[in-house]
């Protein structure tokens, strides 16, 4: 039987015949058990966590992770150097910023070290897996008697992010939401001075630099209205 050789040239599946040979079900060995899926997220392009469900293994197993980048200067196979653990069993790998190359195909291989033929290789587009930090420093400016402008900051390249603003008054049962492009500002043209407003924002790495589906966490809310400070009606900063 072949042994698994990690080769980053796109044809890393050296054990195909073993797995594709038809075998009677009573002869299936542990090496045919599927490995858990690996799910990776890149947090603000500062670090990446690739995790798997270690409890899906029939017995506690310290699975190992290798990775490389396809068709690039970084195509050398790398071992995970910083494992994440769940109940003392490997359940993930953390990669640091210098190991993240957003626009190269990321190849990740999970393997059972006790059964080297038992391996699974996935390919990922990291630019679709970026989750930015929540927006910060929300501020409200009164542009006119009835118009408010909400501004915020992101700890990332602003042009890469789109945003979702939600707001409601104390009288509302649900949030009203509005999509905002990379400009990270939002105007509410008609404000009722008798009501108290709450605003919050979240951001996503989409569509200019990637096609991420996952939003950041919500920002801390900021409030405006009848029971906020009257000392400076033109500027309210973040109220946690």
């Amino acid at each position: 039987l072949n042994t698994t050789i990690l080769t980053p040239n796109g044809n890393e599946d050296t054990t195909a015949d073993f797995f594709l040979t038809t075998m009677p079900t009573d002869s299936l060995s542990v090496s045919t058990l599927p490995l858990p899926e690996v799910q990776c997220f890149v947090f603000n392009v500062e670090y990446m966590n690739c995790t798997w469900n270690s409890s899906s293994e029939p017995q506690p197993t310290n699975l190992t992770l290798h990775y490389w980048y396809k068709n690039s200067d970084n195509d050398k196979v790398q071992k995970c150097s910083h494992y994440l653990f769940s109940e003392e069993i490997t359940s993930g790998c953390q990669l640091q910023k210098k190991e993240i190359h957003l626009y190269q195909t990321f190849v990740v291989q999970l393997q059972d070290p006790r059964e080297p033929r038992r391996q699974a290789t996935q390919m990922l587009k990291l630019q679709n897996l970026v989750i930015p930090w929540a927006p910060e420093n929300l501020t409200l400016h009164k542009l006119s008697e009835s118009q408010l402008e909400l501004n915020w900051n992101n700890r990332f390249l602003n042009h890469c992010l789109e945003h979702l603003v939600q707001y409601r008054t104390d009288w509302d049962h649900s949030w009203t939401e509005q999509s905002v492009d990379y400009r990270h500002k939002f105007s509410l043209p008609s404000v009722d001075g008798q009501k108290r407003y709450t605003f919050r924002v979240r951001s996503r790495f989409n569509p200019l630099c990637g096609s991420a589906q996952h939003w950041s966490e919500w920002s801390h809310p900021i409030h405006w209205g009848s029971n906020t400070s009257k000392e400076n009606p033109f500027l309210f900063a973040l109220e946690a």
Partner: nanobody
Framework: QVQLVESGGGLVQAGGSLRLSCAAS????????MGWFRQAPGKEREFVAV???????FYTDSVEGRFTFSRDNAKNAVYLEMNDLQPEDTAVYYC????????????????????WGRGTQVTVSS
Amino acid sequence: QVQLVESGGGLVQAGGSLRLSCAASGRSLSRDAMGWFRQAPGKEREFVAVMSWGGDTFYTDSVEGRFTFSRDNAKNAVYLEMNDLQPEDTAVYYCAAAPTSFATTAYSSSNSYSYWGRGTQVTVSS
């Protein structure tokens, strides 16, 4: 019972094109990672192209820019458009499906796939 049936193979001259189809019955492919693999005589089965159910697509180096993987969930089918075919593309082409939890999972390892078709022969003459 799950069945994957490939079609569209044949004999073509170098530089020609073919479109392979893979139709599924007994299971919806909409949340499966899908793969095309090939096996030439006397060689290992190798991955050609893979697609997550979220739509991320990847190709082996030798077919990048020549082959295009697509899927039609309404027809429960996937396709492999092959252009500028070369004699080294001669092989039996297999379609495979892997149930996955995450929209981004795209396996290039054949042992990760649960369901396989019987294959369709592609022969490219020089």
